[in-house]
């Protein structure tokens, strides 16, 4: 029996009965938040062999081992993961061992076993036999191995029953519990699974099988399951489903969902039966089961029941996330907010078409309308009184409509109205008339030349840069000294700069009237000598990074023909010089023969330029005398060599500090202070833990239904 699509067992341990007939859980399995310690011995689910997504255990009191619950769980496929993990065991207060002695394969994803105060038998499991890569496993904050004394079956009687493997240069027995070994297949099977009797399974089997070399006897399939057989690919006229089985068209057409988007059902795309067309594709007609590529962003039509959608906060804008066509009218009224420009762009930036009118009033937080960065058509099917389809009234800080050099906006029907926008230059409005095709529609009073732009530097002169010099973390720039008609009106200059990977920034990006600004600002006083050109040294920059820079003259609000004169430069793009890269990350070395070392690493986090090559240096080390100090024929336990694994828990370090001659006197030495790199690594580690814990809590805690 297939169960799913994901099973969430919480609060009441008797809900476990839901697993009674399950052989495959198509989806995830959550067992969590059972705070009353129960006796789980009567609960056993031997039928369950496969979980297609992930297994999550969190705060289940009284559960001491998973082996009795799931004695035959063989494969966790990890088709969908929980924060990159296919197995998560977190804060299980009473768990003493994992005990999943039949678990042979975690197909995708890593494991995270954290904060389980009583959990042992972690160092005795060789996860590399179960997972492809163990480097992303996170096993931290469990019972310290020294307190565990893990013993594999038969070790005490000197008749060890389990096989040995090497982990971190430690060759040891591998087991799940005190009486269950970790199963290993003969080397002759290679990557194939094997039966209980060590006969090799069919190549299409995964985990285990009930008979050798038989694709109908698999416990789980390496690729896909269809009509009782494990197959490398789904046969013609069948489609992949949930990453593990093949289904026909009728099956796909009849899947029912409890999600609001279900009115059109599942689709078939690229040989797979899926809930929605993937990103960049759209259904080929409303009732179609097939997808076609979108031209540009995929259309998403949003409609407002009340015809007019008022955007007065980030929350109201959130409702429009992903919308490309808005059926109705937009009324924008943003008086205040934090980081408002980028938030609005995030939620409204995909809107291309508004079928009704757009009205922006009392939006004192807005400096620009560039957050509507894809708006290209206002249809004006519904208009405001007076036949207006674009209406801009009393926006005290609005300085820019859009960057008209990179903007094509059409207003199909209706007029424009602008009044009481003191920082919006009339030239900007006239430019919009031309671009949108509304020139000639407006009557004289529709664009008020007196109360639009009366507090702005509308007739701007252009400042020209005269020189630029760069180093790895500095830029020096100079520009022509600006000379207004009356030199006393020039107060100073302001230099704006920011990182700009692409040459597409505008002055108003990320800027609002409430203090948010993506640009860094530096004030530059006038040089006392009138012949010296003004300039600045920008320091603390990143190597090999492109910056956008522009300069504005700060002038007195000197009114000339009702307008203020000002000056600013074009935006200059300039890249800092390359520098030495940071160190390569995650260096690992292993020997695969008596005369070879394989060394792997990841690129540096800060390349600081274009990496062209790596230099690998090595040297021969003298043989470690440690290896000769022990009689390997004795029955005493072989001393364990400690290897730093980068995640030493504080409570696990119990050794006393060494006593050595220090500073001429005998006495204990203090531990060396941590290097900056170590402190940073610890900080990142703590941060990563917090992020995961937040993700966990946000994912699993849900409000009670009313």
């Amino acid at each position: 029996e297939i169960c799913g699509p994901g099973i969430d067992i919480r609060n009441d341990y008797q809900q476990l009965k839901r697993l009674e007939n399950c052989t495959v859980i198509e989806g995830y399995l959550h067992i969590l938040l059972i705070s009353k310690a129960e006796d789980y011995r009567s609960y056993r689910f031997p039928k369950l062999t496969v979980i297609t997504e992930y297994l999550l255990l969190f705060r289940v009191a009284g559960l001491e081992s998973l082996g009795d619950l799931f004695p035959n769980l063989t494969v966790i496929r990890g088709w969908k993961l929980f924060y990159n993990y296919a197995l998560v065991i977190f804060e299980m207060t009473n768990l003493k061992d994992i005990g999943l002695y039949n678990l042979r394969n975690i197909t995708r994803g890593a494991i995270r076993i954290e904060k389980n105060a009583d959990l042992c038998y972690l160092s005795t499991v060789d996860w590399s036999l179960i997972l492809d890569a163990v480097s992303n496993n996170y096993i931290v904050g469990n019972k310290p191995p020294k307190e565990c004394g893990d013993l594999c079956p038969g070790t005490m009687e000197e008749k060890p029953m389990c096989e040995k493997t090497t982990i971190n240069n430690e060759y040891n027995y591998r087991c799940w519990t005190t009486n269950r070994c970790q199963k290993m297949c003969p080397s002759t099977c290679g990557k194939r699974a094997c039966t209980e009797n060590n006969e090799c399974c069919h190549p299409e089997c995964l985990g285990s099988c009930s008979a050798p070399d038989n694709d109908t006897a698999c416990v789980a399939c390496r690729h896909y399951y269809y009509a009782g057989v494990c197959v490398p690919a789904c046969p013609p006229n069948t489609y992949r489903f949930e990453g593990w089985r093949c289904v026909d068209r009728d099956f796909c057409a009849n899947i029912l969902s409890a999600e609001s988007s279900d009115s059109e059902g599942f689709v078939i795309h690229d040989g797979e039966c899926m809930q929605e067309c993937p990103s960049g594709f759209i259904r080929n007609g409303s009732q179609s089961m097939y997808c076609i590529p979108c031209e540009g962003p995929c259309p998403k039509v949003c409609e407002e029941e009340k015809k007019t959608k008022t955007i007065d906060s980030v929350t109201s804008a959130q409702m429009l996330q992903g919308c490309t066509i808005f059926k109705g009218n937009l009324l924008i009224n943003i008086r205040r907010g934090n980081n408002i420009a980028s938030e609005l762009e995030n939620f409204m930036g995909l809107i291309e078409v508004v079928t009704g009118y757009v009205k922006i009033r009392h939006s004192h937080a807005l400096v620009s309308l560039s957050f509507l960065k894809n708006l290209r058509l206002i249809l004006g099917e519904e208009q405001l009184e007076g036949n207006y389809s674009f209406y801009v009234l009393d926006n005290q800080n609005l300085q820019q409509l859009w960057d008209w050099d990179h903007r094509n906006l059409t207003i199909k029907a209706g007029k424009m109205y602008f009044a009481f926008n003191p920082k919006l230059c009339v030239s900007e409005i006239y430019r919009m008339e031309e671009v949108t095709g509304t020139k000639g529609r407006q009557s004289k009073g529709d664009i008020n030349t007196r109360n639009n732009g009366e507090r702005a530097s509308c007739e701007s002169d252009v400042l020209h840069f005269t020189s630029t010099t760069t180093s790895k973390n500095r830029i020096i720039i100079t520009w022509h000294r600006y000379r207004p008609p009356d030199y006393r009106d020039l107060i100073s200059f302001t230099v704006y700069y920011k990182e700009a990977p692409f040459k597409n920034v505008t002055e108003y990006d990320g800027q609002d009237a409430c203090g948010s600004n993506s640009w860094n600002m530096v004030d530059v006083d006038l040089p006392p000598n009138k012949d010296v050109e003004p300039g600045i040294l920008l320091h603390g920059l990143k190597p090999w990074t492109q910056y956008a820079v522009y300069v504005k003259a700060v002038t007195l609000t000197m009114v000339e023909n009702d307008h203020i004169r000002g000056a600013k430069s074009e935006i200059l793009y300039i890249r800092t010089n390359a520098s030495v890269p940071s160190i390569p990350l995650d260096v690992l070395s292993a020997s695969n023969s008596s005369s070879q070392l394989i060394v792997k690493w990841n690129p540096p986090s800060l390349p600081n330029g274009n990496l062209s090559y790596y230099i690998v240096r090595w040297q021969r080390q003298p043989q470690d005398g440690y290896l000769y100090r022990h009689n390997y024929c004795s029955k005493d336990k072989i001393p364990i060599r400690k290897y730093a694994d980068g995640t030493i828990d504080i409570e696990e370090v119990t050794e006393n500090p060494k006593t050595e001659v220090c500073g001429g006197e005998k006495g204990p030495c203090c531990a060396c202070p941590k290097t900056e790199a170590e402190k940073q690594a610890e900080k990142e580690e703590a941060e990563y833990r917090k992020v995961f814990e937040n993700f966990l809590h946000n994912s699993i805690f849900v409000p009670r239904p009313e």
Epitope: I2, G4, R18, I255, L256, E259, S260, S263
Partner: nanobody, 123 residues
Framework: EVQLVESGGGLVQPGGSLRLSCAAS????????MSWFRQAPGKEREFVSA????????YYADSVKGRFTISRDNSKNTLYLQMNSLRAEDTAVYYC????????????????WGQGTLVTVSS
Amino acid sequence: EVQLVESGGGLVQPGGSLRLSCAASGGTFSSFVMSWFRQAPGKEREFVSAISGSGSRAYYADSVKGRFTISRDNSKNTLYLQMNSLRAEDTAVYYCAANPRRATPGFTQYAYWGQGTLVTVSS
């Protein structure tokens, strides 16, 4: 924990009609796929019909297609099964079932079940 309570069963003559209801509590009703199953005396439980969370899509077992109609009223947290042209072989205990997120064809392992209501078709 979701609770389901069926009602509306009873004795009806062949060719007659009956409307079953299933009242749900303890969960967000619209976030469950709802289904009707039935179990005739001495037989295994069999699937009758299922409906999506929004009520926009449904499917039926071949044996009831064209005679039975499944529907739901999410504002009242209630599932319905309108049974017309009833036959003697429709006699069974009818169960209402709920599953979160999704249900695939042939799927029987629903998360939540009602106690059932008996429908008897006899002259």
